[in-house]
């Protein structure tokens, strides 16, 4: 099923879906929508990149990394019960016939009334492994034959521990890269 | 509510190129994906191929040497062609459309035979 | 091609009582799963999408659930106007493949 990813009332939610271009500039359109991915495109758009830039966005929705390098992970701004759903991230690979389409679920939970804890910053400790959207282990790679300038990795989950919009926003806001691929 | 409707012959005779028109309303066709899908008579239902907005189109590998999906965005029609047509392409022919395929024509029936 | 294998190829059952018709695909398709009636004389009808969502205007008697390869289709509290055929459809790879139907008929 879906990977679920957390957030609280009144925070920020993030999203994550990557993937590789074969060179800087050398884009690929993506869509997010709101809803399970449809047969085609994405269903009610909440943004959208082209081969350059976002083209369409809506109020709250945006993308916080560098999607020149294929970070089209989505933050959504400020998020209440409403927000809770699944959300498709699709990466419209041109000249072949199967984009790559990863459906993610967004749970929203009532804010905590108790003080935050201590901002975690041990980020090997929480993020130990890199997960795929198809099949299981390390990160996988898949060259598509037909498009020999487009690497396309696989990956719309950054890990089983990263399900909580706070940590993402921990691992963002220390500067950590993440290497995939 | 986007409304289908499939036009063409009853009959075609084998080796002979098939042509039906799928008339759209409550839609343009300049927007979306518009397919093509159809019904054996053994019940089996084949997916055949779109043309979406772009005019961009995909066609299922098995017919891909004999088929092609064209449209007139001024009719607010598009249209299925098959070649060199057996008795094997006996079906209920459909026009769809929608998220996930949401939306269906009636079908049109066509059945190849000398 | 992602093949689908759909089961039983037909069904009889009583008014009122309960259907599982079930769909195996080749390879796992993510969920990406569709459900829909047909009657004679008329276009398919989606039932359900994303493999559990209830399109809009259909009944709760209705319900679908699977992940990976394996999926099922249930209709309980069977009613006159629910025979009909019954396809599966996977929409994760193109080009989209059925199922090879069931058909429904009322005892």
């Known amino acids: 099923s879906e990977v679920e990813y957390r957030a609280e009332v009144g925070q920020n939610a993030y999203l994550p879906c990557f993937y590789t271009p074969a060179a800087p500039g050398n884009l690929v359109p993506v869509c997010w929508g709101k809803g399970a991915c449809p047969v085609f495109e994405c269903g009610n758009v909440v943004l959208r990149t082209d081969e350059r830039d976002v083209n369409y966005w809506t109020s709250r929705y945006w993308l916080n990394g560098d999607f020149r390098k294929g970070d089209v992970s989505l933050t959504i701004e400020n998020v209440t019960l409403a927000d809770s759903g699944i959300y498709c991230c699709r990466i419209q690979i041109p000249g072949i016939m199967n984009d790559e389409k990863f459906n993610l679920k967004l749970v929203i939970k009532p804010a905590k009334v108790t003080p935050a804890p201590t901002r975690q910053r041990d980020f090997t400790a929480a993020f130990p492994r890199m997960l795929t959207t198809r099949g299981h282990g390390p990160a996988e790679t898949q060259t598509l034959g037909s498009l020999p300038d487009i690497n396309l990795t696989q990956i719309s989950t950054l890990a089983n521990e990263l399900r909580d919009s706070r940590l993402a926003n921990d691992l963002r806001d220390s500067g950590a890269t993440i290497r995939i691929g | 509510e986007v409304q289908l409707q499939e036009s063409g012959p009853s009959l075609v005779k084998p080796s002979q190129t098939l042509s039906l028109t799928c008339s759209v309303t409550g839609d343009s066709i300049a927007s979306a994906y518009w397919n093509w899908i159809r019904k054996f008579p053994g019940n089996k239902l084949e997916y055949m191929g779109y043309i979406n907005y772009s005019g961009s189109t995909y066609y299922n590998p098995s017919l891909k040497s004999r088929i092609s999906i064209t449209r007139d965005t001024s009719q607010n029609q598009y249209y299925l062609q098959l070649n060199s047509v057996t008795t094997e392409d006996t079906a209920t022919y459909y026009c769809?459309?929608?998220?996930?395929?949401?939306?269906w024509g009636r079908g049109t029936t066509l059945t190849v035979s000398s | 091609d992602i093949q689908m294998t759909q089961s039983p190829s037909s069904l009889s059952a009583y008014l009122g009582g309960k259907v599982t018709i079930t769909c195996k695909a080749r390879?796992?398709?993510?969920?990406?799963i569709g459900w829909y009636q047909h009657k004679p004389g008329k276009g398919p009808r989606l039932l359900i999408w994303y493999t559990s969502t209830l399109q809009s205007g259909i009944p709760s008697r209705f319900s679908g659930s699977g992940s990976g390869r394996d999926y099922s289709f249930n209709i309980n509290n069977l009613e006159p106007e629910d025979i009909a055929t019954y396809y599966c459809l996977q929409y994760d790879n193109l080009p989209f493949t059925f199922g090879t139907g069931t058909k429904l008929e009322i005892r």
């Open positions: 769809v459309t929608g998220d996930y395929f949401d939306y």
């Open positions: 390879q796992d398709v993510r969920k990406n």
